[in-house]
């Protein structure tokens, strides 16, 4: 028997320094939590003491904090040649500075390889990308080798920037030949590395002939076995055992997101490769494990361009920036408008002739817009002024809900107006009028949204039994500010960007702003 | 992140005292700030919210048109200036914030004791 | 809006499970929250929205309910977790619940 211990992480998007538990800024250094230093010193403990280690990520390092927002993901490449890592997938998230952003940064500058077998590549960028990522990897482990196949999620052209050269085929389809090809090459022990969610995980496990472990990531599926050691609530145990179409047991693993844990997964294979016995768990790293000095001293003096940056002008904005309470609890905000317009713009993919945009719409809780900006003070727009607006460090988020739940949503936004309460609603891409002489739950009297399957868009009523895209906050997707029916009734749910970094993205592209007040949300009284 | 109260102690009634929370580690400013207490051997009781930016206030019936709450962001500091003071006001104040999408903060308390 | 928690105080064992309800006067959604407070302390939060824990809190403990009717559960008690525990409503002006004191057996 031969003993292969595998390291994992996934969705560590951006989380270079320690964090708060939450994965949010570390404020009690005492009681922070990941950070490339402290998994550098728990990777290299489990180096020193164990023969045979693979050190893997499943995609989505980019997007997530300022660092990706300065660095671009030099910073990926950089700390994780530093931890050096064995191989990595490809997720959604990599393609966000589209695929010049992906290969410039990232796949040059990465000494380990950079899989996906299901992305391929056509027309000029075939030849500009051919061997910066690869289907597989055979690497050499002791005295053995272990095959490595990558896999990325095929909504990527909705949930990011991919340009149109590069085709997402399905997972399963593009895996098993890939995986055949291995087993020629008389590769016996493989493992499936990728970025599609747990459920399609599970699907590669039980459908491709040849997969002897699966390493995922994207939804950011927390598993263990016996009492979790933080808050985060198993979806299952460590590692989840798969029973594939052909009878072999075949173990799933992710290791929840943030860089918050490393995945600790030992597999004992036989001599031809079967799967013996696998066991393990995520291991918390918490601040009973020291951070690295060499790697945390890089990670200073990396930081020192983080602090000029957020001073610096990322636009102007040549009107006040109304996110004062007494509008956006209230009424329509310019501010509302803004931020759900850099939505909108963030998730611009143009992916189908029949469609625009795959999404048109945009909702925002009006308590999470914590602060007005002035354009007296020359119009300029910092980091900063951005962070006292968004001070939450969430993201923004796609969501497919059924127009019944939308409807939901907008009776809740207004259910108890007038007391000044967060839930009130602002939007893009949708019309709204409320009549508050009506009782609550009733109190919406028009709904129009924006089409999308349409080449000049407009606004139609909303229809109860279909199913919408929507961008909306982390925060209302987790049913935050009472939205409970957004939690209990979405049937789809994609992690976006960070919500600063989606809006100083658009004042940078825009260079001057002018948000309006123009009528998306109304009130009427009797008869309409 | 802290919050540290101060201005508690021992005065008679119908006196007056003002409270301090001073705040420090987080945005301040972004926060809707309160107020609550509790009587010695007693539960919980919610005093008073002010918005972040200063625009709203509530108070609890029980101390409405006596006490004032009020803030100075560019000090980082909630104020609640309590007024005709009664025996039954005697308490632990504390400030806290309001639950935000990462949770709550809370100080530690001050207390305060009304008695002739 | 009242909030009526029951029972009072309870008594229990390590390793027990545990439920405290919480009854609101009039519909709140989600708008509750649970905490926890010992002898000379602040309260600490556990549950906010309802059902989502708050950072740092184990996972043994959990919130559930809609509307008028709230529950925290604690799956398996610790030694730790002998104290006093308020619900909060924070639909209309926050309102606590009188507090229910769990004890060791």
């Known amino acids: 028997a031969w003993e292969l211990t595998i390291l994992h992480t996934n969705d560590v998007h951006s989380r270079l320094e320690q964090t708060s538990e939450d994965s949010s800024k570390c404020v009690n250094a005492s009681r922070c939590m990941g950070g490339v230093a402290r998994l550098f010193t728990k990777v290299q403990q489990i180096r020193r003491a164990e023969p045979n280690v693979l050190l893997l990520d499943a995609g989505d390092q980019y997007q997530g904090t300022i660092w990706f927002t300065v660095y671009k993901g030099a910073e990926v490449a950089h700390f994780m040649n530093a931890l050096r890592y064995d191989a990595m997938a490809l997720g959604n998230h990599e393609f966000d500075n589209g695929v010049e952003g992906l290969i410039e940064p990232l796949l040059k500058e990465a000494k380990f390889p950079i899989l996906s077998a299901n992305i391929k590549a056509k027309g000029p960028l075939a030849s500009q990308i051919s061997g910066l990522y690869l289907p597989y990897k055979v690497l050499p482990v002791g005295d053995e080798v272990v095959g490595i196949v990558g896999y990325t999620s095929k909504e990527t052209p909705f949930l990011s920037n991919p340009g149109t050269n590069l085709v997402f085929e399905d997972e399963i389809t593009a895996l098993q030949p890939e995986v055949d090809k291995l087993k020629t090459l008389n590769v016996n022990k493989i493992i499936a590395l990728g970025h599609s969610g747990f459920e399609m995980d599970k699907l590669i496990a039980q459908k491709v002939r040849g997969v002897d472990v699966v390493v995922g990531g994207h939804s950011n599926t927390f598993l263990y076995t016996g009492n979790p050691p933080s808050k985060e609530v198993p979806a299952g145990k460590y590692p989840f055992i798969v029973t594939s179409d052909d009878g072999r047991k075949v173990p799933v693993v992710q290791a929840y997101a943030f860089g918050k844990y490393l995945g600790y997964l030992k597999i004992e294979f036989d001599e031809r490769g079967n799967v013996i016995s696998s066991h393990g768990n995520p291991i918390l790293l918490n601040s009973s494990i020291p951070e690295d000095p060499s790697i945390k001293a890089d990670i200073n003096k990396w930081r020192i361009k983080l602090d000029n940056y957020s001073t610096q002008e990322l636009g102007k904005t040549i009107v006040y920036l109304d996110g004062s309470s007494q509008s956006c609890r209230f009424r329509e905000c310019n501010m509302g408008n803004l931020i759900c317009d850099a939505m909108i713009n963030n998730n611009l993919r143009h992916t189908d002739e029949m469609f625009w945009n795959h999404v048109s719409m945009c909702i925002l809780n009006g308590g999470g817009i914590r602060s007005p900006i002035d354009e007296r003070n020359n119009g300029t727009i910092t980091w900063e002024n951005l962070a006292a607006v968004l001070p939450f460090g969430g993201t923004f988020d796609l969501v497919q809900l059924k127009g019944s739940t939308l409807k939901k949503a907008f009776e809740h936004s207004v259910h108890r107006y007038g007391q000044s309460t967060g839930e009130f609603l602002q939007v893009g891409g949708i019309h709204v009028v409320y009549d508050l002489s009506r009782k609550p739950g009733d109190r919406v009297v028009k709904l129009d949204v924006l089409c999308t399957k349409c080449r000049v868009p407009s606004y139609d009523p909303l229809k109860m039994d279909e199913v919408y895209k929507v961008i909306l906050p982390n925060f209302l997707a987790n049913g935050g500010d009472g939205f409970q029916m957004i939690k209990d009734e979405l049937l789809r749910h994609d992690s976006g960007d960070q919500d600063i970094n989606v809006v100083s993205t658009y004042i940078s592209k825009m260079k001057v702003i002018y948000p309006a007040v123009e009528g998306r949300i109304k009130f009427s009284t009797g008869s309409h | 992140v802290q919050l540290v109260e101060s201005g508690g102690g021992l005065v008679q009634p119908g006196g007056s005292l003002r409270l301090s929370c001073a705040a420090s580690g987080f945005t301040f400013s972004s926060y809707d700030m309160h107020w609550v207490r509790q009587a010695p051997g007693k539960g919980l009781e919610w005093v008073a919210v002010?918005?972040?930016?200063?625009?709203?206030?509530y108070y609890a019936d029980s101390v409405k048109g006596r006490f004032t709450i009020s803030r100075d962001n560019s000090k980082n500091a909630l104020y609640l200036q309590m007024n005709s003071l009664r025996a039954e006001d005697t308490a632990v104040y504390y400030c806290?914030?309001?639950?935000?999408?990462?949770?709550?903060?809370w100080g530690q308390g001050t207390l305060v004791t009304v008695s002739s | 809006i009242q909030m009526t928690q029951s029972p009072s105080s309870l008594s229990a064992s390590v390793g027990d499970r545990v439920t405290i309800t919480c009854r609101a006067s009039?519909?709140?959604?989600?708008?509750l929250a649970w905490y926890q407070q010992k002898p000379g302390k602040a309260p600490k939060l556990l549950i906010y929205?309802?059902?989502t824990l708050q950072s740092g809190v184990p996972s043994r403990f959990s919130g559930s309910g809609s509307g008028t009717d709230f529950t925290l559960t604690i799956s398996s008690l610790q030694p730790e977790d002998f104290a006093t525990y308020y619900c909060q409503q924070s639909y209309s002006t926050p309102h606590f619940g009188q507090g229910t004191r769990l004890e060791i057996k």
């Open positions: 009039q519909g709140i959604s989600n708008y």
């Open positions: 806290a914030t309001e639950i935000a999408a990462k949770g709550d903060y």
């Open positions: 929205a309802a059902s």
């Open positions: 002010m918005s972040y930016e200063g625009s709203n206030k």
